[in-house]
């Protein structure tokens, strides 16, 4: 069962995803997605990240902390009531089915 | 038009080894990842195995992932499956196919024409 | 491994009905379904996806359901061209899995 976290309509929602880098600045490709985490992947990406940067992200949805330093907890500005359901923030360490998946569920009052 | 044209089956004996390929052209092949799958005699379909598009993530079935090596050449656009160890349950038809993943993850939209293994005793 | 149900294994048909297949994953897989097509002798060709998104440049007469554990893919006015075998896929969790496939037939 998916963790839950709560945040009020208006506000901001913070969905919290850490990994800790194999160095500092060695980082791995992470993507977070409306919905459960599918088999590979995320499902409706939201924001997304590389080997360096940011380099995917829709309106109202960032990265607040220090994602160079394993921090990738998605921030959702102003939420809607339609913001409410699962997030998947998937971190895909390099190799053979290494990946790391979190399913997250938000709830909007 | 996207493209995806397999070779390197044949018929191989029991034990032996065979080296897939799929040659991609028609879209850009470093930004989707790929797929190799299955069709067994029974036409049962079955995956096989999946890389990134960078090749740094990687993921396969169970019965294969000691046995079968998938990788990929990005500068000449084509997948390769490194099968070794064969044993009859590998007797199928073997497709290459993309999967689209930057803004939302959708399996095998295109598949090649596929390409035969047959393992004897 | 999640096991996907296919039902019927056959099924007869005349040119102008509506037809139904379903998929009954033996776990939740959300909306992560897909429908492909495959003709005699062709690789598969994807029709659906996300359970019910039709990929570009297949007929509206193609229509996905379900969401959970059941799926449907139904086929309004059947055409020639449909006659073919027709297998569903999950990629929810992994391995990623297909139903072991509907034939349709002309009765």
């Known amino acids: 069962s998916e963790v839950e976290y709560r945040a009020e309509v208006g506000q901001n929602a913070y969905l919290p995803c850490f990994y800790t880098p194999a160095a500092p600045g060695n980082l791995v490709p992470v993507c977070w997605g409306k919905g459960a985490c599918p088999v590979f992947e995320c499902g409706n990406v939201v924001l997304r990240t590389d080997e360096r940067d940011v380099n995917y992200w829709t309106s109202r949805y960032w990265l607040n902390g220090d994602f160079r330093k394993g921090d990738v907890s998605l921030t959702i500005e102003n939420v809607t009531l339609a913001d409410s359901g699962i997030y998947c923030c998937r971190i895909q360490i390099p190799g053979i089915m290494n990946d790391e998946k979190f399913n997250l569920k938000l709830v909007i009052k | 038009e996207v493209m995806l044209m397999e070779s390197g089956g044949g018929l191989v004996k029991l034990g032996g080894s065979l080296k897939l390929s799929c040659a991609a052209s028609?879209?850009?092949?470093?930004?989707?990842?790929m797929s190799w799958v299955r069709q067994t005699p029974e036409k049962r379909l079955e995956w096989v195995a999946t890389i990134s598009n960078s090749g740094g993530s990687i993921y396969y079935l169970d019965s294969v992932k000691d046995r079968f090596t998938i990788s990929r050449d990005n500068a000449k656009n084509t997948l390769y499956l490194q099968m070794s160890s064969l044993n009859s349950e590998d007797t199928a038809v073997y497709y290459c196919?993309?999967?689209?993943?930057?803004?939302?993850?959708?399996?095998?939209?295109?598949w090649g024409q596929g390409t035969s293994v047959t393992v004897s005793s | 491994s999640i096991v996907m149900t296919q039902t019927p294994k056959f099924m007869s048909t005349s040119v102008g009905d509506r037809v139904s297949v379903t998929c009954k994953a033996s776990?939740?897989?959300?909306?992560?379904v897909a429908w492909y097509q495959q003709k005699p002798g062709q690789s598969p060709k994807p029709l659906i996806y996300?359970?019910?998104t039709r990929h570009t440049g297949v007929p509206a007469r193609f229509t996905g359901s379900g969401s959970g554990t059941d799926f449907t893919l139904t086929i309004s006015n059947v055409q020639s061209e449909d006659l073919a075998e027709y297998f569903c896929?999950?990629?929810?969790?992994?391995?990623?899995?297909f139903g072991a496939g509907t034939k349709l037939e002309l009765k």
């Open positions: 996300s359970a019910s």
């Open positions: 028609g879209f850009t092949f470093s930004s989707y990842y």
């Open positions: 776990q939740y897989v959300d909306t992560y």
């Open positions: 196919a993309r999967d689209p993943y930057y803004s939302n993850y959708v399996p095998m939209d295109y």
């Open positions: 896929a999950q990629y929810s969790s992994s391995p990623l899995t």
